[in-house]
């Protein structure tokens, strides 16, 4: 038994036929010693007398609000809730399994940007006697603060004969660092109480994995002279992180009829304009995704093709925006070849995802994973890799990136990747290895050797251990190169001499 909140207790029960249940001792919160009687819920039947009451809790009939009285006066209450465990598994009767992205997904969370603000939601078919309480933190062993509001009913839907209720909650990390590479996941815990049943649900994620931008805004069409083609332009959504030269998006533009089966035109671009073929009765749609990390695509923003004549023309901003004026060269060190670094780091992002594309479908955050991922270098908040830090002195950040590149380059050349099951040299991992080396050489200033971090002694003996470690390393590498690519893209746009 444990206390959920003041005067509310959860009794954990193994739930099987003829289970002995749990013996619970309730103590009346009073200085009085005698003349105390106990009742349950609205019943006037006296269950016992004395300052303590011992009960055997086996089923829901034994749970409820226990009240101690003296001479018709209520002294205190103790609400007992039951938490069922069947075959070693805690019950999940209150919430509906959303089955996306995998089975046993009860909580789903999304973030519109990297500000540390996110929304979680869940579904239930229960309409009454239902309460939720949400807690969250960054990491679990040494948790950092995340503040969550109250869960509210956000939608009601009819599903066949049933009504389905959607609840949602907004949370905000207290000291968010949008530009940093996350090393500890956000933990979300939801306590659900239905009548006398208690259940808890958890979700663990990195903000980068739950990013889903809002749709692009201000779609405009401009027909091109003497052509079937139309130039479509748009802008970054207002809710996306800034500056856009650092937090860049990529876009998919599609021309589609009302039916998905109809023919279409489709093009991908990093710019905020594209040229497509518009058809009568079709619509032009644009959606967005983080340019350097393969999280979710936004919903589509659409405009009908037929409106192309009357809509205001004007092309998009052409780039990833937010560039502003060219800034001064880097103090205290030579400036890198920003554009070359940008191109190579973007290639690294692509290679990191092609080396391990299924990463999103595998839950590798198992017990002890915080330790594993902390063995690799992370670009942290104080490393100067945020836009302001780069402007002040990019050398700190570049040194950190260089250390990380060398570290991962050594890891990819180590027994973890060279041992069984073997990888061929021109596999994506082989190309990734070579590109990491190439970028680290671009960064290393002449006659200047930065310190490099020691590789931890990770020597898995079994092929399956090696495979698991590869997944985890590539997962971390995807996050690391995404931050590096943002740094170089921003540098190329704003710091190039």
């Amino acid at each position: 038994i444990w206390e959920l909140k003041k005067d509310v207790y959860v009794v954990e029960l193994d739930w099987y036929p003829d289970a002995p249940g749990e013996m619970v001792v309730l103590t009346c919160d009073t200085p009085e010693e005698d003349g105390i009687t106990w009742t349950l819920d609205q019943s006037s039947e006296v269950l016992g007398s004395g300052k303590t009451l011992t009960i055997q809790v086996k089923e829901f009939g034994d749970a409820g609000q226990y009240t101690c009285h003296k001479g018709g006066e209520v002294l205190s209450h103790s609400l007992l809730l039951l938490h069922k465990k069947e075959d070693g598994i805690w019950s999940t009767d209150i919430l509906k399994d959303q089955k996306e992205p995998k089975n046993k997904t009860f909580l789903r969370c999304e973030a519109k940007n990297y500000s540390g603000r996110f929304t979680c939601w869940w579904l239930t078919t229960i309409s009454t006697d239902l309460t939720f309480s949400v807690k969250s933190s960054r990491g679990s062993s040494d948790p950092q603060g995340v503040t969550c509001g109250a869960a509210t009913l956000s939608a009601e839907r009819v599903r066949g004969d049933n009504k389905e209720y959607e609840y949602s909650v907004e949370c905000q990390e207290d000291s968010a660092c949008p530009a940093a590479e996350e090393s500890l996941p956000i933990e979300v815990m939801v306590d659900a109480v239905h009548k006398l049943k208690y259940e808890n649900y958890t979700s663990s994620f990195f903000i980068r994995d739950i990013i889903k931008p809002d749709p692009p805004k201000n779609l405009q069409l401009k027909p091109l002279k003497n052509s079937r083609q139309v130039e479509v332009s748009w802008e970054y959504p207002d809710t996306w992180s800034t500056p856009h030269s650092y937090f860049s998006l990529t876009f998919c533009v599609a021309v589609q009829g009302k039916s998905k089966r109809e023919k279409k035109d489709r093009v991908f671009t990093d710019k905020t304009s594209a040229t497509v073929i518009c058809r009568k009765n079709a619509s032009i749609s644009v959606r967005a995704q983080d340019r350097y990390y393969s999280s979710s695509w936004s919903e589509w923003a659409s405009v009908p093709c037929s409106g192309s004549g009357s809509s205001r023309g004007g092309s998009g901003s052409g780039g990833s925006g937010g560039g502003g004026s060219k800034l001064r060269a880097v103090p205290g060190g030579s400036s890198p070849a920003w554009t070359q670094c940008q191109q190579l780091s973007q290639k690294l992002c692509t290679l990191a995802w092609s080396a391990h594309p299924l990463v999103g479908h595998m839950d590798l955050r198992e017990e002890g994973d915080e330790e594993t991922t902390n063995d690799v270098p992370h670009i942290q908040c104080g490393d100067g890799c945020d836009p302001q830090g780069l402007r002040d002195n990019s050398q700190f950040c570049l040194q950190r990136i260089h250390q990380g590149l060398i570290f991962y380059e050594k890891l990819l050349g180590s027994d973890i990747f060279t041992g069984e099951p073997s990888l061929l040299p021109d596999s994506p991992v082989g190309q990734l290895h070579a590109s990491l080396l190439g970028l680290s050489q671009l960064l290393q200033p002449e006659g200047h050797h930065w310190e490099t971090q020691q590789i931890p002694s990770l020597s898995p003996s079994q092929p399956w251990q090696r495979l698991l470690l590869r997944f985890k390393i590539l997962r971390s590498l995807q996050a690391f190169v995404a931050v590096a690519a943002r740094v170089f893209a921003h540098g190329a746009a704003t710091l190039s001499p």
């Epitope: 079937r228 083609q229 023919k263 093009v267 991908f268 671009t269 040229t275 058809r279």
Partner: antibody, heavy 118, light 107 residues
Amino acid sequence: QVQLVQSGAEVKKPGASVKVSCKASGYTFTDYYLHWVRQAPGQGLEWMGWIDPENGDTEYAPKFQGRVTMTTDTSTSTAYMELRSLRSDDTAVYYCNANKELRYFDVWGQGTMVTVSS
Amino acid sequence: EIVMTQSPATLSVSPGERATLSCRASQSISINLHWYQQKPGQAPRLLIYFASQSISGIPARFSGSGSGTEFTLTISSLQSEDFAVYYCQQSNSFPLTFGGGTKVEIK
């Protein structure tokens, strides 16, 4: 299944015109874009243009603009590509292809060899 | 127009070995890049679309990667039926253009 069957080989004199046909089957003709791509002997592939059979819209590669005409006959599910003012370097295999997506080529015809020789 | 350059022009590989074919665009084309296989006397066949998307019916040994200006087609373990010419094609803008092709031949 989706199939494209092209007309037979042609031999033409320089300055003449050629009209290659491409009969579609296995799908609703107006549901796919139709492209024409050619390949000179021992050479690579060269895109010529596309047509939307639903409305007759076309887009031609600048190199062929003014010399090529793409048409369709929806009643027979047939596409045509006419190339005028033929030169010896127009000697090639001409392929028609169809796709629901405009910008790449999913289903190909077997090809029609057009020889331009005096 | 966007110029597509493939390398090498010819690649000699033994059956069972891995083949890596490169394609470079003269300007950034995001992932608007498609790969085709052509055997002698046959029409080309679509293998990969949008840089890395696989086609149903195409063996899993064919995979694509890349974005921007550099792209790769990888055949993980060459089978006898894979010896052919491979073309890349950009769809970023009209006119649509192809690379010159890479001939994969038996070593």
